[in-house]
Amino acid sequence: AYRPSETLCGGELVDTLQFVCGDRGFYFSRPASRVSRRSRGIVEECCFRSCDLALLETYCATPAKSERDVSTPPTVLPDNFPRYPVGKFFQYDTWKQSTQRLRR
Protein backbone atom coordinates (compact mmCIF):
# COMPACT_ATOMS: atom_id res chain seq x y z
CA ALA A 1 0.00 0.00 0.00
CA TYR A 2 1.18 3.50 -0.72
CA ARG A 3 1.85 5.97 2.06
CA PRO A 4 -1.19 8.26 2.52
CA SER A 5 1.10 11.26 2.94
CA GLU A 6 2.74 10.76 -0.46
CA THR A 7 2.36 13.74 -2.78
CA LEU A 8 3.60 14.77 -6.20
CA CYS A 9 3.83 18.40 -7.27
CA GLY A 10 5.00 20.58 -10.11
CA GLY A 11 7.06 19.02 -12.85
CA GLU A 12 7.40 15.76 -10.96
CA LEU A 13 3.62 15.36 -11.08
CA VAL A 14 3.49 16.14 -14.80
CA ASP A 15 6.38 13.83 -15.64
CA THR A 16 4.84 11.00 -13.62
CA LEU A 17 1.48 11.51 -15.34
CA GLN A 18 3.23 11.31 -18.71
CA PHE A 19 4.91 8.08 -17.61
CA VAL A 20 1.69 6.51 -16.28
CA CYS A 21 -0.57 7.61 -19.14
CA GLY A 22 1.93 7.15 -21.96
CA ASP A 23 0.49 7.76 -25.43
CA ARG A 24 -2.97 8.28 -23.99
CA GLY A 25 -2.03 11.74 -22.70
CA PHE A 26 -3.70 13.26 -19.65
CA TYR A 27 -5.88 16.06 -18.32
CA PHE A 28 -5.43 18.28 -15.29
CA SER A 29 -9.13 18.01 -14.45
CA ARG A 30 -11.87 15.43 -14.85
CA PRO A 31 -15.62 15.90 -15.37
CA ALA A 32 -17.60 15.66 -12.12
CA SER A 33 -19.06 12.20 -11.64
CA ARG A 34 -21.95 10.82 -9.63
CA VAL A 35 -19.66 10.00 -6.74
CA SER A 36 -17.87 13.32 -6.78
CA ARG A 37 -19.96 16.43 -7.26
CA ARG A 38 -16.99 18.58 -8.16
CA SER A 39 -13.80 17.83 -10.01
CA ARG A 40 -10.92 18.77 -7.75
CA GLY A 41 -8.21 18.52 -10.37
CA ILE A 42 -4.96 16.61 -10.31
CA VAL A 43 -2.97 19.43 -8.71
CA GLU A 44 -5.27 19.66 -5.70
CA GLU A 45 -5.59 15.90 -5.35
CA CYS A 46 -2.02 14.78 -5.94
CA CYS A 47 0.05 17.73 -4.77
CA PHE A 48 -1.96 19.04 -1.85
CA ARG A 49 -3.76 15.90 -0.65
CA SER A 50 -2.30 12.47 -1.43
CA CYS A 51 -1.59 10.49 -4.53
CA ASP A 52 -1.43 6.93 -5.76
CA LEU A 53 -1.14 5.24 -9.13
CA ALA A 54 -4.85 4.45 -9.33
CA LEU A 55 -5.68 8.12 -8.89
CA LEU A 56 -3.13 9.16 -11.50
CA GLU A 57 -4.68 6.69 -13.97
CA THR A 58 -8.05 8.44 -13.69
CA TYR A 59 -6.52 11.55 -15.26
CA CYS A 60 -5.32 9.76 -18.38
CA ALA A 61 -7.09 11.10 -21.47
CA THR A 62 -8.26 7.80 -22.98
CA PRO A 63 -9.23 4.81 -20.84
CA ALA A 64 -6.77 1.92 -20.87
CA LYS A 65 -7.65 -0.87 -23.30
CA SER A 66 -8.54 -3.20 -20.44
CA GLU A 67 -11.30 -0.85 -19.29
CA ARG A 68 -14.77 -1.59 -20.64
CA ASP A 69 -16.48 1.76 -20.18
CA VAL A 70 -15.20 4.02 -22.93
CA SER A 71 -18.31 6.18 -23.07
CA THR A 72 -16.96 9.09 -20.99
CA PRO A 73 -16.33 12.10 -23.24
CA PRO A 74 -12.91 13.73 -23.06
CA THR A 75 -12.51 16.44 -20.45
CA VAL A 76 -12.77 20.04 -21.62
CA LEU A 77 -9.42 21.61 -20.83
CA PRO A 78 -9.17 24.86 -18.87
CA ASP A 79 -8.11 28.01 -20.72
CA ASN A 80 -4.82 28.01 -18.84
CA PHE A 81 -4.01 24.41 -19.81
CA PRO A 82 -0.32 23.50 -19.88
CA ARG A 83 2.49 25.22 -21.55
CA TYR A 84 4.56 22.56 -19.77
CA PRO A 85 7.31 21.07 -21.94
CA VAL A 86 5.22 17.94 -22.47
CA GLY A 87 7.11 15.11 -24.10
CA LYS A 88 10.52 16.74 -24.01
CA PHE A 89 13.58 15.10 -22.47
CA PHE A 90 12.08 11.71 -21.62
CA GLN A 91 13.50 10.78 -18.23
CA TYR A 92 12.50 7.18 -17.65
CA ASP A 93 14.56 6.74 -14.50
CA THR A 94 13.11 9.83 -12.85
CA TRP A 95 9.54 8.84 -13.61
CA LYS A 96 10.21 5.26 -12.53
CA GLN A 97 11.45 6.52 -9.16
CA SER A 98 8.30 8.60 -8.70
CA THR A 99 5.95 5.73 -9.53
CA GLN A 100 7.93 3.39 -7.28
CA ARG A 101 7.48 5.89 -4.42
CA LEU A 102 3.72 5.76 -4.99
CA ARG A 103 3.70 1.97 -4.97
CA ARG A 104 5.43 1.71 -1.59
Epitope: G10, V43, F81, R83, P85, K88
Partner: antibody, heavy 120, light 107 residues
Framework: EVQLLESGGGLVQPGGSLRLSCAAS????????MAWVRQAPGKGLEWVSS????????KYADSVKGRFTISRDNSKNTLYLQMNSLRAEDTAVYYC?????????????WGQGTMVTVSS | DIQMTQSPSSLSASVGDRVTITCRAS??????LNWYQQKPGKAPKVLIH???TLESGVPSRFSGSGSATEFTLTISSLQPEDFATFYC?????????FGPGTRLSSK
Protein backbone atom coordinates in the same frame (compact mmCIF):
# COMPACT_ATOMS: atom_id res chain seq x y z
CA GLU B 1 -4.93 45.33 -14.69
CA VAL B 2 -3.78 42.21 -12.84
CA GLN B 3 -2.71 43.27 -9.36
CA LEU B 4 -1.84 41.97 -5.91
CA LEU B 5 -1.62 44.33 -2.94
CA GLU B 6 -0.21 43.16 0.41
CA SER B 7 -0.83 44.77 3.80
CA GLY B 8 -0.43 43.97 7.49
CA GLY B 9 3.34 44.08 7.88
CA GLY B 10 5.08 45.85 10.72
CA LEU B 11 7.31 45.53 13.76
CA VAL B 12 6.57 42.70 16.17
CA GLN B 13 8.40 41.18 19.12
CA PRO B 14 9.78 37.63 19.05
CA GLY B 15 7.00 35.21 19.93
CA GLY B 16 4.38 37.62 18.65
CA SER B 17 1.81 37.30 15.89
CA LEU B 18 0.93 39.13 12.71
CA ARG B 19 -1.64 38.63 9.96
CA LEU B 20 -0.81 39.58 6.40
CA SER B 21 -3.45 40.19 3.72
CA CYS B 22 -3.20 40.25 -0.05
CA ALA B 23 -5.98 41.77 -2.14
CA ALA B 24 -6.21 40.45 -5.70
CA SER B 25 -7.79 42.11 -8.72
CA UNK B 26 -7.81 41.81 -12.50
CA UNK B 27 -8.01 38.01 -12.70
CA UNK B 28 -10.29 35.21 -11.53
CA UNK B 29 -8.74 34.77 -8.11
CA UNK B 30 -10.78 31.66 -7.24
CA UNK B 31 -9.22 29.67 -10.10
CA UNK B 32 -5.58 29.88 -9.07
CA UNK B 33 -3.18 28.39 -6.58
CA MET B 34 -1.72 31.29 -4.57
CA ALA B 35 1.50 31.49 -2.61
CA TRP B 36 3.56 33.54 -0.18
CA VAL B 37 7.25 34.07 -0.92
CA ARG B 38 9.60 35.99 1.38
CA GLN B 39 12.94 37.75 1.09
CA ALA B 40 15.13 38.53 4.10
CA PRO B 41 17.04 41.83 3.89
CA GLY B 42 19.86 41.52 1.37
CA LYS B 43 19.07 37.84 0.79
CA GLY B 44 17.41 35.66 -1.83
CA LEU B 45 13.85 34.47 -2.31
CA GLU B 46 12.23 31.71 -0.24
CA TRP B 47 8.91 30.02 -0.94
CA VAL B 48 6.83 30.02 2.26
CA SER B 49 3.43 28.49 1.56
CA SER B 50 0.84 27.68 -1.12
CA UNK B 51 -2.91 27.14 -1.08
CA UNK B 52 -5.19 25.49 -3.64
CA UNK B 53 -7.86 27.48 -5.45
CA UNK B 54 -10.66 26.17 -3.24
CA UNK B 55 -8.72 26.97 -0.08
CA UNK B 56 -9.13 23.47 1.27
CA UNK B 57 -5.53 22.32 1.11
CA UNK B 58 -2.20 23.93 1.91
CA LYS B 59 1.56 23.37 1.80
CA TYR B 60 4.32 24.95 3.90
CA ALA B 61 8.08 25.27 3.94
CA ASP B 62 9.61 23.33 6.84
CA SER B 63 10.89 26.59 8.32
CA VAL B 64 7.36 27.87 9.01
CA LYS B 65 5.38 24.65 9.46
CA GLY B 66 3.25 24.69 12.60
CA ARG B 67 3.68 28.45 13.05
CA PHE B 68 2.22 29.98 9.88
CA THR B 69 -1.25 29.41 8.39
CA ILE B 70 -2.21 30.33 4.86
CA SER B 71 -5.86 30.88 4.00
CA ARG B 72 -8.02 32.62 1.44
CA ASP B 73 -11.48 34.16 1.06
CA ASN B 74 -12.51 33.79 -2.57
CA SER B 75 -15.61 35.93 -2.03
CA LYS B 76 -13.30 38.81 -1.08
CA ASN B 77 -10.49 37.95 -3.53
CA THR B 78 -8.10 37.98 -0.59
CA LEU B 79 -5.20 35.79 0.50
CA TYR B 80 -3.99 35.70 4.13
CA LEU B 81 -0.95 34.59 6.09
CA GLN B 82 -1.36 34.21 9.84
CA MET B 83 2.09 34.23 11.43
CA ASN B 84 2.46 33.05 15.04
CA SER B 85 5.48 32.42 17.27
CA LEU B 86 7.52 34.80 15.17
CA ARG B 87 11.31 34.62 15.26
CA ALA B 88 14.05 37.05 14.29
CA GLU B 89 14.77 34.92 11.21
CA ASP B 90 11.22 35.57 9.95
CA THR B 91 12.21 39.19 9.32
CA ALA B 92 11.66 39.71 5.60
CA VAL B 93 9.63 41.32 2.88
CA TYR B 94 6.63 39.05 2.29
CA TYR B 95 5.23 38.83 -1.22
CA CYS B 96 2.01 37.18 -2.29
CA UNK B 97 2.18 35.60 -5.71
CA UNK B 98 -0.08 33.95 -8.26
CA UNK B 99 1.04 30.48 -9.34
CA UNK B 100 0.90 29.56 -13.04
CA UNK B 101 -0.19 26.09 -12.00
CA UNK B 102 -0.80 24.83 -15.54
CA UNK B 103 2.23 26.52 -17.06
CA UNK B 104 5.20 25.35 -15.04
CA UNK B 105 4.45 26.64 -11.54
CA UNK B 106 6.22 29.93 -12.11
CA UNK B 107 4.98 32.89 -10.09
CA UNK B 108 3.71 35.24 -12.80
CA UNK B 109 2.09 37.98 -10.71
CA TRP B 110 3.61 39.43 -7.53
CA GLY B 111 2.50 42.02 -5.04
CA GLN B 112 4.72 44.94 -4.02
CA GLY B 113 5.58 43.22 -0.74
CA THR B 114 5.05 44.06 2.92
CA MET B 115 7.89 44.27 5.43
CA VAL B 116 7.78 42.19 8.59
CA THR B 117 10.38 42.98 11.25
CA VAL B 118 10.73 40.69 14.26
CA SER B 119 12.81 42.39 16.92
CA SER B 120 12.79 43.14 20.64
CA ASP C 1 14.92 19.44 -1.19
CA ILE C 2 16.42 20.42 -4.52
CA GLN C 3 19.30 22.89 -4.15
CA MET C 4 19.83 25.55 -6.78
CA THR C 5 23.16 27.29 -7.41
CA GLN C 6 23.96 30.21 -9.70
CA SER C 7 27.14 31.52 -11.26
CA PRO C 8 28.53 34.02 -11.20
CA SER C 9 27.14 35.53 -8.01
CA SER C 10 27.79 38.96 -9.49
CA LEU C 11 29.09 40.40 -12.71
CA SER C 12 29.76 43.78 -14.29
CA ALA C 13 28.92 44.45 -17.91
CA SER C 14 28.36 47.30 -20.34
CA VAL C 15 25.38 48.26 -22.46
CA GLY C 16 25.44 46.19 -25.64
CA ASP C 17 27.29 43.26 -24.06
CA ARG C 18 26.12 39.67 -24.34
CA VAL C 19 25.60 38.27 -20.84
CA THR C 20 25.15 34.65 -19.75
CA ILE C 21 24.10 33.46 -16.29
CA THR C 22 24.21 29.79 -15.31
CA CYS C 23 21.91 27.93 -12.93
CA ARG C 24 22.48 24.40 -11.69
CA ALA C 25 20.11 22.02 -9.89
CA SER C 26 21.23 19.37 -7.38
CA UNK C 27 19.17 16.77 -9.26
CA UNK C 28 17.49 16.50 -12.64
CA UNK C 29 14.47 18.81 -12.98
CA UNK C 30 13.74 18.18 -16.67
CA UNK C 31 12.92 21.69 -17.99
CA UNK C 32 10.99 22.92 -14.94
CA LEU C 33 13.13 26.00 -14.45
CA ASN C 34 11.99 29.63 -14.24
CA TRP C 35 13.99 32.88 -14.39
CA TYR C 36 13.13 36.12 -12.57
CA GLN C 37 14.48 39.64 -12.65
CA GLN C 38 14.38 41.83 -9.53
CA LYS C 39 15.28 45.49 -9.28
CA PRO C 40 16.08 47.14 -5.91
CA GLY C 41 12.97 47.77 -3.83
CA LYS C 42 10.73 46.02 -6.35
CA ALA C 43 9.04 42.63 -6.59
CA PRO C 44 10.53 39.93 -8.81
CA LYS C 45 9.25 39.65 -12.37
CA VAL C 46 9.12 36.37 -14.28
CA LEU C 47 11.13 36.45 -17.51
CA ILE C 48 11.16 32.82 -18.63
CA HIS C 49 9.29 29.72 -17.56
CA UNK C 50 9.78 26.07 -18.49
CA UNK C 51 13.49 26.79 -19.14
CA UNK C 52 13.03 28.49 -22.50
CA THR C 53 9.52 29.96 -22.84
CA LEU C 54 9.64 33.74 -22.88
CA GLU C 55 6.97 35.33 -20.72
CA SER C 56 4.54 37.66 -22.49
CA GLY C 57 5.88 41.21 -22.75
CA VAL C 58 9.49 40.27 -22.04
CA PRO C 59 11.96 41.57 -24.67
CA SER C 60 13.31 38.99 -27.11
CA ARG C 61 16.91 39.80 -26.12
CA PHE C 62 16.27 37.50 -23.14
CA SER C 63 16.48 33.78 -23.80
CA GLY C 64 16.74 30.63 -21.74
CA SER C 65 18.06 27.16 -22.45
CA GLY C 66 19.05 23.94 -20.76
CA SER C 67 17.56 20.81 -19.27
CA ALA C 68 18.13 18.30 -16.48
CA THR C 69 20.62 20.04 -14.16
CA GLU C 70 22.20 22.88 -16.13
CA PHE C 71 20.45 25.99 -17.42
CA THR C 72 21.43 29.36 -18.84
CA LEU C 73 19.85 32.77 -19.11
CA THR C 74 21.26 34.90 -21.92
CA ILE C 75 20.82 38.59 -22.61
CA SER C 76 21.93 39.09 -26.22
CA SER C 77 22.51 42.83 -26.05
CA LEU C 78 22.39 44.41 -22.60
CA GLN C 79 20.17 47.48 -22.20
CA PRO C 80 20.34 50.10 -19.39
CA GLU C 81 17.10 48.81 -17.86
CA ASP C 82 18.47 45.25 -17.58
CA PHE C 83 20.77 45.92 -14.61
CA ALA C 84 19.22 43.97 -11.74
CA THR C 85 19.46 40.72 -9.79
CA PHE C 86 18.43 37.53 -11.56
CA TYR C 87 17.08 34.42 -9.82
CA CYS C 88 16.39 30.92 -11.11
CA UNK C 89 13.70 28.75 -9.52
CA UNK C 90 12.94 25.06 -9.87
CA UNK C 91 9.31 24.00 -10.11
CA UNK C 92 9.96 20.29 -10.30
CA UNK C 93 8.99 19.48 -6.73
CA UNK C 94 7.87 21.18 -3.53
CA UNK C 95 9.43 23.06 -1.88
CA UNK C 96 9.96 25.17 -4.99
CA UNK C 97 13.45 26.54 -4.41
CA PHE C 98 15.28 29.57 -5.77
CA GLY C 99 18.91 30.10 -6.62
CA PRO C 100 20.89 32.62 -4.53
CA GLY C 101 20.78 35.21 -7.30
CA THR C 102 23.19 36.86 -9.73
CA ARG C 103 23.68 40.61 -9.40
CA LEU C 104 24.27 42.29 -12.75
CA SER C 105 25.79 45.77 -12.45
CA SER C 106 27.12 48.40 -14.81
CA LYS C 107 30.85 48.29 -15.59
Amino acid sequence: EVQLLESGGGLVQPGGSLRLSCAASGFTFSEYVMAWVRQAPGKGLEWVSSIVSSGGYTKYADSVKGRFTISRDNSKNTLYLQMNSLRAEDTAVYYCAKDMTYSGDAFDVWGQGTMVTVSS
Amino acid sequence: DIQMTQSPSSLSASVGDRVTITCRASQSINTYLNWYQQKPGKAPKVLIHAASTLESGVPSRFSGSGSATEFTLTISSLQPEDFATFYCQQSYSVPFTFGPGTRLSSK
